[in-house]
């Protein structure tokens, strides 16, 4: 007779790992016990549990409660076991040993390996400002048995650097990705995968990019310098920019107050029925938490008595 | 002829603890499971322990589990019973007996000693 | 325990059946004590097996999970207490003995 088992068992942390063992003996031949010992290198042999052909199982206290036989029907020449819920201290070599009649005793081994899937975790760099040159976005870190694979999935120009930490059982990889932040990569997605055959799928964290930054201002409405005539009604200036965060915007006049009747909403400035007394230089002032911009305008409101117009200077400073 | 010799018994203290020894002879001793059985004054036969051929595999009645501890010596042919927490039921004729096979069954007794007698009291 | 009579009795010549059950495993033996205090004495072990010093008049047979001592032509020699063993999960066992009168 000879006995059939496996080189190697894998099984996923948490999940039941059958070591199978058996005895393909000619007819007549009867198995008395079949023992099952943990074998690693350098140790000596750790008795798991015994299948006895009268006795029926034992487990040695080690194993309590985690050692059981394969559910009915049983051959009686198949001493396979189960071992429950297994863990990564579980992973090594295996003895199965048979005793037949009369055939004698007959061994073999076989390697557990416990695939141990890892708990991907993403984070964040520091604030990405534009302007800055090249920037940690995100470090993603994954352990697992064995190594994990750790890539990124991204729209987004940049570079990544890996870095793998072994400890006894098991592996950390780290992986880094840099770039140099510019406004276009606001709100795109920063995607760490990580592969490994413990997963039934990869596992992917997704990361939205906020790059912080302020536009030039600019102010429009003054487009067309001959509306703005005594009398016109809805005269407005609005002041434009962009930025991360959103920015607030502030406007003041700089050769004296706002005029009277004058509304301020946001960006927006809103003038009553024009009068020579809006004429002047009005200055819109935009910040967020990574800067601010001014733009100012000069208005000058035309008397249609007058012949002449007048010019108008547009001035941006930052 | 098998024979088991068994030693160790008297009177001892409550609370302490005793060591009884069998040596074995007349048969292959490594090949055969071993046992304690015992008998209180007046009671039936009660399984104490037993022990497997290769000694990696021991079983205990439950009225000595946790306080007792069965081993075999191959090169001794012997067994022994270290039964510690001493209390007054233990006290009886400790018989040690042979497996006709690798376990310790009792349906598998084909052999026994003359047995030892212990008794707990102060 | 395994569970056995307390007693049986038969006059000399007759044939006296003990039965035992129980335990977790189908095999037992049956043991023979004369007078408490004396060794045991195999009669029957691995449910069928008789040592060889052991007259024939012992035999044992199994039906179904009860199992039989069958002592055929009682002798006065015979009286005893007659302890059936056997497993239970983890450990070995035994019944609490049944006491055979010979009238």
């Known amino acids: 007779g000879e006995l059939e088992t496996s080189d190697v068992v894998t099984v996923v942390l948490g999940q039941d790992a059958k070591l199978p063992c058996f005895y393909r003996g000619d007819s007549g031949e009867q198995v008395g016990q079949v023992a099952w010992a943990r074998v690693d290198a350098g140790e000596g042999a750790q008795e798991l549990a015994l299948l006895h052909s009268k006795y029926g199982l034992h487990v040695s206290p080690a194993y309590e409660g985690r050692v059981e036989q394969p559910p009915p029907p049983r051959n009686p020449l198949d001493g396979s076991v189960l071992l429950r819920n297994a863990v990564q201290a579980d992973e090594g070599e295996y003895e199965c040993r048979v005793s037949t009649f009369p055939a004698g005793s007959f061994q073999a081994r076989l390697r557990l390996r416990v695939l141990v899937p890892p708990l991907p975790s993403l984070n964040p760099g520091p604030a990405l400002e534009e302007g800055q040159g090249l920037t940690l976005a995100a470090s993603c870190t994954a352990e697992g048995s064995p190594a994990p694979s750790v890539t990124w999935d991204t729209e987004v120009k940049g570079t990544t650097s890996s870095r793998s930490f072994k400890h006894s059982r098991s592996a950390a990889v780290t992986s880094e990705f840099h770039l140099v932040p510019s406004r276009s990569m606001n709100g795109q997605p920063l995607t760490c995968v990580v592969s490994h055959p413990g997963l039934l799928q990869d596992q992917r964290i997704t990361h939205i990019l906020h790059v912080s930054f302020l536009a030039e201002a600019s102010v429009r409405g003054l487009e067309d310098q001959n509306l703005w005539h005594i009398g016109r009604e809805g005269a407005m200036l609005k002041c434009l920019s962009e930025g991360q965060p959103p920015p607030s915007y502030n406007w003041t006049r700089l050769d004296g107050p706002l005029p009277s009747g004058v509304r301020v909403d946001g960006d927006t400035l809103g003038f009553p029925p024009l009068t020579t007394e809006h004429s002047g230089i009005y200055v819109c002032h935009v910040s967020n938490e990574f800067s601010s911009r001014d733009s100012q305008v000069t208005v000058d409101v035309l008397d249609p008595q007058e012949d002449s117009g007048k010019q108008v200077d547009l001035v941006s400073a930052s | 002829a098998v024979t088991l010799d068994e030693s160790g018994g008297g009177l001892q203290a409550p609370g302490g603890g005793l060591s009884l020894v069998c040596r074995a002879s007349?048969?292959?001793?490594?090949?055969?499971?071993m046992f304690w059985v015992r008998q209180a004054p007046g009671k039936g036969l009660e399984f104490v322990a037993g022990i497997s051929d290769a000694g990696s595999w021991t079983g205990y009645g439950a009225a000595v589990k946790g306080r007792a501890t069965i081993s075999r010596d191959s090169g001794q042919s012997t067994v022994r019973l270290q039964l510690n927490n001493l209390r007054a039921e233990d006290t009886g004729i400790y018989y040690c007996?042979?497996?006709?096979?690798?376990?310790?069954?009792?349906?598998?007794?084909?052999?026994w000693g003359h047995g030892t007698e212990v008794i707990v009291s102060s | 325990a395994l569970t056995q009579p307390s007693s049986v009795s038969a006059n000399p010549g007759e044939t006296v059946k003990i039965t035992c059950s129980g335990g977790?495993?189908?095999?037992y033996g049956w043991y023979q004590q004369k007078s408490p205090g004396s060794a045991p004495v195999t009669l029957i072990?691995?449910?069928?097996k008789r040592p060889s010093d052991i007259p024939s008049r012992f035999s044992a047979s199994k039906s179904g999970s009860t199992h039989t001592l069958t002592i055929t032509g009682v002798r006065a020699e015979d009286e005893a207490v007659y302890f059936c063993g056997g497993w239970d999960k983890s450990a070995g066992i035994f019944g609490a003995g049944t006491t055979l009168t010979v009238l």
């Open positions: 072990y691995n449910n069928n």
């Open positions: 007996a042979k497996s006709a096979g690798d376990w310790y069954g009792a349906d598998d007794i084909d052999a």
């Open positions: 007349g048969f292959t001793f490594s090949s055969h499971g």
């Open positions: 977790s495993s189908n095999y």
